[in-house]
Interface confidence: low
Amino acid sequence: ECVTQLLKDTCFEGGDITTVFTPSAKYCQVVCTYHPRCLLFTFTAESPSEDPTRWFTCVLKDSVTETLPRVNRTAAISGYSFKQCSHQISACNKDIYVDLDMKGINYNSSVAKSAQECQERCTDDVHCHFFTYATRQFPSLEHRNICLLKHTQTGTPTRITKLDKVVSGFSLKSCALSNLACIRDIFPNTVFADSNIDSVMAPDAFVCGRICTHHPGCLFFTFFSQEWPKESQRNLCLLKTSESGLPSTRIKKSKALSGFSLQSCRHSIPVFCHSSFYHDTDFLGEELDIVAAKSHEACQKLCTNAVRCQFFTYTPAQASCNEGKGKCYLKLSSNGSPTKILHGRGGISGYTLRLCKMDNECTTKIKPRIVGGTASVRGEWPWQVTLHTTSPTQRHLCGGSIIGNQWILTAAHCFYGVESPKILRVYSGILNQSEIKEDTSFFGVQEIIIHDQYKMAESGYDIALLKLETTVNYTDSQRPICLPSKGDRNVIYTDCWVTGWGYRKLRDKIQNTLQKAKIPLVTNEECQKRYRGHKITHKMICAGYREGGKDACKGDSGGPLSCKHNEVWHLVGITSWGEGCAQRERPGVYTNVVEYVDWILEKTQAV
């Protein structure tokens, strides 16, 4: 059962796993949610009746029954983890805590103009978990305007104390605001020989990389595969760090794989969601339950629905035994990973999908697309919406993309002459315009947010957000697309598609069926040569064939240029402008979304 509200002056008795320090009960709830075993917590707020050494303690708790006895205690705030909830969860915490000093290892001290600058510095420093900033009013003259960057083993403070005229806060890496590079490569036959901060068991290097990504201290990893010569180290995932933030030594070793934490691009890749099945593999751990199941998929469902289950092993039924049902072993461990991994016993293992909601919805795999052909099929581009205007008569105006459950990203130029959001309707999950009838459900638009530097499409800043009046329930036919990571600026996308209901030639009409075209990206230098009368800025991205023939056109405006990278679709561009349509040596020009990620997050995450 999902319980989101906090219980004031209430303490849960027993069930303690560990104690951490957090600046608020709200953040304690987030820490509990991300902890592999925590189901409940008790936080102690500052209070004259409470011993100051216990202020800001966050006690993480577990219980077989998923609840614990409640005791009245002033200044105690208790609650449940969000593991039991189905809604999207984020570790992003933008709050600034006034007059609180969050203790940790102070590894960097520098002058900063503001707390915001200090937070940005922390966000862009590979080691930084949180910071404390001494304001202009701080009593000690030599410490004023000093920004202290801090880290700890757990990613949370080792203590929190009251201190006048300082402010503290957390790194915004988990808000997708870091400019740190995102190195997605996994290096085969490589061992990184730096200090290990932890080790876990993992079935493959990808799971190892994901574990590294959400481990607070891990910057890179080495994984020993099941063919590794030393038996005791097979399937071992070593989580590593170094002072420089990069591996100091790389050793060539067969059957080992190494890679980097994907912390700075974690909002656009699955980090918690290990959805694969591992055949002829047994995961060992503490047994939670043994139940009969028809298949390994059914076993995974059972694990996902059992809140304490972290991973499972399914042993298929022996012929004609138990109505064809096999045994499903639901398991858990202290760190969420198997305590040992065995091969050759015939089991099929995997992980709970409960944690998938901690990843961005946009990373979910969608149905395979049909290659070739220009008409799309239902569910092929589930983020694509059709934006209609109802004035003077109802018609398709522009495309757009779902980027959040209340947000559509589109082009600013679509709203030329649009006086009010009241005349707009957003239809999602649509393949054919003819599906839209008077009674077709739509999303009303609460607000149009146009970039304040927008003047005209060709000058750039052709980007706008629509805040919807109601939230989108994600389904197979309507779900978000990932924004590109700022750390992915140098990625070369090779699988890019433009979609829309726009014209198929310069003089045409809106198409009934959603059209798609695979289009190669063009360098900005090349694009600039084709548009000498314009300034092609780094905030634009171009795509098109030299010989023309495939392009966006009138009515596609605002729609996505979607590129697939590492199995995840990213919204690389917004259809903006171009000379004519599909003309020879005239690429389409798109708003370069990666350059606006800060703007998008600022607008969509505004309180």
């Epitope: 082009a411 130029h413 679509c414 030329y416 005209m456 499409a457 060709e458 052709d462 726009g502 030639k505 310069l506 003089r507 045409d508 084709r530 548009y531 000498r532 009368g533 314009h534 966006a552 056109c553 009138k554 009515g555 596609d556 405006s557 605002g558 259809t575 903006s576 402008w577 171009g578 000379e579 004519g580 349509c581 003309q583 040596e585």
Partner: antibody, heavy 127, light 107 residues
């Protein structure tokens, strides 16, 4: 105010050459395709040549292809028409014109339509 | 190239009347049609493009219609300053072609 001013017209013998110039003002010259259109005395309009905004491509009807060359100097906001091997049927008023485009995103559309005309330069080819 | 046939070649009408000029294309030009007005001794001026879109500054008594291969220009409430020759032009590709013109006079 958009202005297109032609010069260089006159009387020329068949087989000889002539160069027309057109100075543009009042608009961003390098955003527009430019076109020469001619009109024989008492007759209709005939398209002669077009050039893209950056000068990268040029287009001609069969009647003048290989004899006429359109060019532009964006730095000087000037359009040119070099006419070689002139014939009597080339006698006409030659108009320097600007092609229209709509500029609003993918409503930014190039039309092969003229929305501004010069006053015309008279060319007479006669012996 | 697309051939454009304009009719009538000339016409005479009274002030305040409505007149129609027709233009026939030799193939479908997808509404890629413009109308120009050329007053005596002057350069032509764009009236209409996209078959029915009025160019900025052009009086609303001028209107265009049609699709496929058949198009027309309508001038309602004829005024003395409308005395001119009217040309249609197709632009379904850059090889634009014009109609022969229609000379409009006042009775």
């Amino acid at each position: 105010e958009v202005q297109l001013v032609e010069s260089g017209g006159g009387l020329v013998q068949p087989g000889r050459s002539l160069k027309l110039s057109c100075v543009a003002s009042g608009f961003t010259f390098n955003n527009h395709w430019m076109t020469w259109i001619r009109q024989a005395p008492g007759k209709g309009l005939e398209w002669v040549a077009s050039i893209t905004d950056n000068g990268g491509s040029t287009y001609y009807p069969d009647s003048v292809k290989g004899r006429f060359t359109i060019s532009r100097d964006n730095a000087k906001s000037t359009l040119y028409l070099h006419m070689n091997s002139l014939r009597s049927e080339d006698t006409a008023t030659y108009y320097c014109t600007r092609d229209r485009y709509d500029s609003d995103g993918y409503y930014y559309v190039r039309y092969y339509v003229v929305d501004a005309w010069g006053q015309g330069a008279s060319v007479t080819v006669s012996s | 190239d697309v051939r454009m046939t304009q009719s009538p070649a000339s016409l005479s009408a009274s002030l305040g009347e409505t007149v129609n000029i027709e233009c026939l294309a030799s193939e479908d030009i997808y509404s890629d049609l413009a109308w120009y007005q050329q007053k005596p001794g002057k350069s032509p001026q764009l009236l209409i493009y996209n078959a029915n879109s009025l160019q900025n500054g052009v009086p609303s008594r001028f209107s265009g219609s049609g699709s496929g291969t058949q198009y027309s220009l309508k001038i309602s409430t004829l005024q003395s300053e409308d005395v001119a020759t009217y040309f249609c032009q197709q632009y379904s590709n850059y090889r634009r072609t014009f109609g022969g013109g229609t000379k409009l006079e006042i009775n």
